[in-house]
Interface confidence: medium
């Protein structure tokens, strides 16, 4: 399964911070960065860095300390940018992350200094089974971006 999350401030549940996505092992979390046609919004485009953090970092929406891992940067608002995280128990890649069944992982985005964006937060709950099917379940929507 591929779970698509449109990561932008038009997504009310990401804004509130109580969004939950459930993923199984071998699923993919696809993060779609904000994308603008033309000049973009008058307040400027949203750009940010996405981090995996611990619970205190999630609660405070702060990506600081040894348990904050920068995952991706959404810095090209006029391009089509998407990142993928494979939910796997073991990863062969040095930049990959290893996920444990039954655990919850926390993602936040921190707006860049020039950005109009707000703090966005997502909880990823990893389930127990390995899955092999390939269908899409998006979370959020392209919104106004």
């Amino acid at each position: 399964l591929r779970h698509v999350v449109y990561w932008n401030s038009s997504n009310p549940r990401l804004l509130r911070g109580d969004a939950v996505v459930e993923l199984g092992l071998n699923d993919y979390l696809d993060i779609v960065c904000p994308h603008y046609e033309g000049p973009g919004p008058p307040e400027g485009p949203e750009t940010f860095a996405l981090y995996m953090v611990d619970w205190p970092g999630y609660e405070s929406c702060q990506a600081e300390g040894p348990r904050a891992y920068k995952r991706w940067v959404c810095s090209l608002p006029f391009g089509h940018v998407q990142f993928s995280e494979k939910i796997q128990r073991f990863t062969p890649f040095s930049l990959g992350f290893e996920f444990l069944p039954g655990e919850t992982y926390y993602y936040i985005s921190v707006p860049t200094p020039e950005s109009s964006g707000q703090c966005l937060r997502l909880q990823v709950s990893v389930c127990c089974k390995e899955r092999k099917s390939e269908s899409a379940h998006p979370v959020g929507s392209p919104g106004e971006s």
């Epitope: 779970h3 009310p12 509130r16 911070g17 939950v20 998006p138 959020g140």
Partner: antibody, heavy 112, light 107 residues
Framework: EVQLVESGGGLVQPGGSLRLSCAAS????????VDWVRQAPGKGLEWLGV???????NYNSALKSRFTISRDNSKNTLYLQMNSLRAEDTAVYYC??????WGQGTLVTVSS | DIQMTQSPSSLSASVGDRVTITCRAS??????VAWFQQKPGKAPKSLIH???YRYSGVPSRFSGSGSGTDFTLTISSLQPEDFATYYC?????????FGGGTKLEIK
Amino acid sequence: EVQLVESGGGLVQPGGSLRLSCAASGFTVTTYGVDWVRQAPGKGLEWLGVIWGGGSTNYNSALKSRFTISRDNSKNTLYLQMNSLRAEDTAVYYCASDWAYWGQGTLVTVSS
Amino acid sequence: DIQMTQSPSSLSASVGDRVTITCRASQNVGTNVAWFQQKPGKAPKSLIHSASYRYSGVPSRFSGSGSGTDFTLTISSLQPEDFATYYCQQYKRYPYTFGGGTKLEIK
């Protein structure tokens, strides 16, 4: 345009059951978390539960497992199954998608 | 469950007034508080999330503040369309709970 339309309300006797529907358009029900909220006449808001995009649910434990949230992806519709209804369950029931979009509500009256 | 105590329960004010509604949580909820506006016979409308952030399209006269246990919703200059009932909600812990509401009436 996102729209939620509740239906299925009406008069039911104490101890009876009712299933409310929340038909969604403008988005797919596997996309958002959808919450159910109720409001007794002249009273405040009470959260009943949520069904997440992945299909899992969380409930208000005060309901004592009498209410169940489900959905039919093919119909893009959510459901609130209510059992062992009591007079105090009389309320307008709303579904809300990510707290941004709400249905118009459907009135449930529990009375003999 | 976390109790949300809202005050006052009703309030009379005039167009142009500055109005403050308060909400107190029975335990620390961080900034996981939202505010809603509801008009008679209508569904609630989201105003504020994360204690102090306005949703898109909400007028700037609405502002929220607070963290921990004490929260406020302020309307800086009341407009005729603002007369309604306002609810706070915590979403730190299940079950999500609402305050009892504040009915804002025309003086």
